[in-house]
């Protein structure tokens, strides 16, 4: 169950999609991906205040026993709840290749 | 793909496993789950240092931008990569029901 | 495997328009990087890139026919359309759609045969 | 528009010979070069990407090499089945142009 969805910490500052831009070489790819020469990276960043975009009940307690024992137990944490896939042109030992990752750029978010 | 499972950082540093135990009253549920009444969590706590347990594509890319840009990009964070189920006696209104989760208990861990 | 088709009225009449479809699978247009483009091929021009478009829909067209050309997509029913207004014998060619991963244009379809008589 | 010239239309050759294909790009276009084959009544089949790197599936008797305005495509080891024409094409810059292709003709 995802729950609020309001941000109580104010506009933009909750777990939420953001797009960073890089280059192969700032993602260390430059020697084995040919295209696209820039990803615009989709990630999820932002806080997870009580029960805000809970993904599930483990977030729920993860929330309640941060609250008792915040020294020992961390806050829920802003990840992706899916992804769109991506297409990369990659080098091989004979030339190159096409291949799909499903797992590279977040969709959208929740915490956990 | 799960990464290095050796941790930089030293013994029990990383993101792995823990168990908490929690009453009914420290989750929140002491109104409307009569068994069990205190519950070994497991949940995934540690730090995620570069490609430790790394889940996918998504998480090395984001300990790439996290190094290059640190206060735009968060670190990887040890989430659950997999759940154990678990049953609660919950109260209804005419009496109690069995009730499964299968959210509730982290399995094994991993960084995204 | 992948597989693209193209299908078209095969002939029409000067200023008429073509519609042409491009049907295809093994690949999806949800994808980020691919894209789907249109290129004809004339024995007297040779070919000609003519547009392409892309998963997020960024649309791009050859400026000499710009005007006359609309590319569109359906995602879901795995299809791209290319329309061709005021049609003249000069369009008389055959037409191929060509997936795109980024900037390669790595299969291509059959090609369908389309001339323009009066 | 970027012409692409590839300024022999017909090259004749035998099986088991080695021939380069060429092509010339009227302003620098970086390494931004495909390399298509046309075998008679088919579509036209990728062989290239960025000038150099073959695509799976592609016999490595075909070499692209070039940067800037001027590239090859070479066969070595020529096979009756590489009768064809071998279209270069720049992906450089909008609209994308082709050259007028090369026929390989097998003696």
């Known amino acids: 169950a995802r729950n609020g969805d309001h941000c109580p910490l104010g506009p933009g500052r909750c777990c939420r999609l953001h797009t960073v831009r890089a280059s192969l070489e700032d993602l260390g790819w430059a020697d084995w991906v040919l295209s696209p020469r820039e990803v615009q990276v989709t990630m999820c960043i932002g806080a997870c205040p009580s029960q805000f975009r809970a993904a599930n009940m483990h977030a729920q307690i993860k929330t309640s026993l941060h609250r008792l024992k915040p020294d020992t137990v961390p806050a829920p944490c802003c990840v992706p709840a899916s992804y769109n896939p991506m297409v990369l042109i990659q080098k091989t030992d004979t030339g190159v290749s096409l291949q799909t990752y499903d797992d590279l750029l977040a969709k959208d978010c929740h915490c956990i | 793909a799960r990464n290095g499972d050796h941790c930089p950082l030293g013994p029990g540093r990383c993101c792995r496993l823990h168990t908490v135990r929690a009453s009914l009253e420290d989750l929140g549920w002491a109104d409307w789950v009569l068994s069990p009444r205190e519950v070994q969590v497991t949940m995934c706590i540690g730090a995620c240092p570069s490609q430790f347990r790394a889940a996918n594509m998504h998480a090395q890319i984001k300990t790439s931008l996290h190094r290059l840009k640190p206060d735009t990009v968060p670190a990887p964070c040890c989430v659950p990569a997999s759940y154990n189920p678990m049953v609660l006696i919950q109260k209804t209104d005419t009496g109690v029901s069995l009730q499964t989760y299968d959210d509730l208990l982290a399995k094994d861990c991993h960084c995204i | 495997q992948v597989t693209l088709k193209e299908s078209g009225p095969g002939i029409l009449q000067p200023s008429q328009t073509l519609s042409l479809t491009c049907s295809f699978s093994g690949f999806s247009l949800t994808t980020s990087g691919m894209g789907v483009d249109w290129i004809r091929q004339s024995s007297g021009k040779g070919l000609e890139w003519l547009a392409h478009?892309?998963?997020?829909?960024?649309?791009r067209y050859n400026p000499s026919l710009k005007s006359r050309l609309t590319i569109s997509k359906d995602t879901s029913s795995n299809q791209v359309f290319l329309k061709i207004t005021s049609v003249d014998t000069a369009d008389t060619a055959t037409y191929y759609c060509?997936?795109?991963?980024?900037?390669?244009?790595?299969?291509w379809g059959q090609g369908t045969s389309f001339t323009v008589s009066s | 528009d970027i012409v692409m010239t590839q300024a022999q239309k017909f090259m004749s050759t035998s099986v088991g010979d080695r021939v380069s294909v060429t092509c010339k790009a009227r302003?620098?276009?970086?390494?931004?070069v495909a390399w298509y084959q046309q075998k008679p009544g088919q579509s036209p089949k990728a062989l290239i990407y960025?000038?150099?790197y073959r695509y799976s599936g592609v016999p490595d008797r075909f070499t692209g090499s070039g940067s800037g305005t001027d590239f090859t495509l070479t066969i070595s080891n020529v096979q009756s089945e590489d009768l064809a024409e071998y279209f270069c094409q720049q992906y450089n810059s909008y609209p994308y142009t082709f050259g007028g292709g090369t026929k390989l003709e097998i003696k």
């Open positions: 960025s000038a150099s």
């Open positions: 060509a997936r795109r991963a980024w900037d390669a244009m790595d299969y």
């Open positions: 478009i892309y998963w997020d829909d960024d649309k």
């Open positions: 302003q620098n276009v970086g390494t931004n």
